[in-house]
């Protein structure tokens, strides 16, 4: 016997109580694939979450975080407090990066400055709490009489100024 449910499109469910008629998903529910026997309840974005995309009969709602927070976890299942550039989030809140480390984002941890000498280069621009050091040519390249076919690359333009 053919399963009539396979004919039910996304946005509907196969209603066994009504002789396998395809019924539309009730309000606040969805089915993203055909042939479903139930519709899933839509996600609700409450508290620290805000709605990024409304639920439809064929797709779930998508959540984002309210201002001052950013998403963590699959499909934004958790929000984490933003910090300023030059800081990292600890158990006691936002703390400035220690000397020798930087963070150029509002999230994540402070990372150590690049050690230019490991690549045989010198420090062209000192690091800050918000920015990594910029490495320049090796000290040998800068010695008198040394010539270079190409000038040293300019210091990279910061993506955006620290807050």
């Amino acid at each position: 016997l053919q399963d009539l449910c396979s004919n039910c499109p996304a946005g509907t469910f196969c209603d066994n109580n009504r002789s396998q008629i395809c019924s539309p998903c009730p309000p606040n529910s969805f089915s993203s694939a055909g042939g479903q026997r139930t519709c899933d309840i839509c996600r609700q974005c409450k508290g620290v979450f805000k709605t990024r995309k409304e639920c439809s009969s064929t797709s779930n709602a998508e959540c984002d975080c309210i201002s001052g927070y950013h998403c963590l976890g699959a499909e934004c299942s958790m929000c984490e407090q933003d910090c300023k550039q030059g800081q990292e989030l600890t158990k006691k809140g936002c703390k400035d990066c220690c000397f020798g480390t930087f963070n150029d984002q509002k999230r994540g941890i402070c990372r150590p400055w690049t050690n230019c000498s490991l690549d045989g280069k010198s420090v062209l621009v000192n690091g800050t709490k918000e920015r990594d050091v910029v490495c320049g040519p090796s000290p040998a390249d800068l010695s008198p009489g040394a010539s270079s076919a190409t000038p040293p690359a300019p210091a990279r333009e910061p993506g955006h100024s620290p807050q």
Epitope: D40, G73, A74, M78
Partner: antibody, heavy 118, light 107 residues
Framework: QVQLKQSGPGLVQPSQSLSITCTVS????????VHWVRQPPGKGLEWLGV???????DYNDAFISRLSITKDNSTSQVFFKMNGLQADDTAIYYC????????????WGQGTTLTVSS | DIVMTQSQKFMSTSVGDRVSVTCKAS??????VAWYQQRPGQSPKALIC???YRYSGVPDRFTGSGSGTDFTLTISNVQSEDLAEYFC?????????FGSGTKLEIK
């Protein structure tokens, strides 16, 4: 430190109402939401409703007709009222702070034990 | 409503062992799941949110995992103070719902 302290009656007659006050300290009700959850004797947890930092409320549909949650930010108090109590409303009632990271409960009150009996 | 099923009502373990408490959601809830510990006579205590993120102060012996419909709370190196009931909770949609609980007994 963060605390939620509950006060309310232990015994209520059938058809009467239950009022519980949850007084919070160590955080502001203008920043955090407060939920109410109950636990019948020897059973699991049941979510009743929440009042958010902006004063908006969400209720479990099963209780929406007889439940009211309000608050006073200035006194750091949340007020829970449930009408038309019956014997199966006998439970421990908890207030709990909403986590700042999700819709879960990161700190709980000590609980108010309610018995509904004549 | 989304039903959270904890099929094991009781689990028995010994100090130092590793134990896994499972929870199954009646539909896909992504990773919008939290876990709580309730010691006898006490209020519940938050352990995990977003399926795998430990709350501050929770020992790293407690680990959450899973997504979609199947979730697990693993306690490694079980201690006597872990004698408690453990509940899962979904926050995908209202009403927020809990599992019926799993009681951990220490031999």
């Amino acid at each position: 430190q963060v605390q939620l302290k509950q006060s309310g009656p232990g015994l209520v007659q059938p058809s009467q109402s239950l009022s519980i006050t949850c007084t919070v300290s160590g955080f502001s009700l203008t920043t955090y939401g407060v939920h109410w959850v109950r636990q019948p004797p020897g059973k699991g947890l049941e979510w009743l409703g929440v009042i958010w930092s902006d004063g908006n409320t969400d209720y479990n549909d099963a209780f929406i007709s007889r439940l009211s949650i309000t608050k006073d930010n200035s006194t750091s108090q949340v007020f829970f009222k449930m009408n038309g109590l019956q014997a199966d409303d006998t439970a421990i009632y908890y207030c709990a702070r909403n986590s700042i990271t999700s819709v879960s409960f990161d700190c709980w009150g000590q609980g108010t034990t309610l018995t509904v009996s004549s | 409503d989304i039903v959270m099923t904890q099929s094991q009502k009781f689990m028995s373990t010994s100090v130092g062992d590793r134990v896994s408490v499972t929870c199954k959601a009646s539909q896909n809830v992504g990773t919008t799941v939290a876990w709580y510990q309730q010691r006898p006579g006490q209020s519940p205590k938050a352990l995990i949110c977003s399926a795998s993120y430990r709350y501050s102060g929770v020992p790293d012996r407690f680990t959450g995992s899973g997504s979609g419909t199947d979730f697990t709370l693993t306690i490694s190196n079980v201690q006597s103070e872990d004698l408690a009931e453990y509940f899962c909770q979904q926050y995908n949609s209202y009403p927020l719902t809990f599992g019926s609980g799993t009681k951990l007994e220490i031999k």
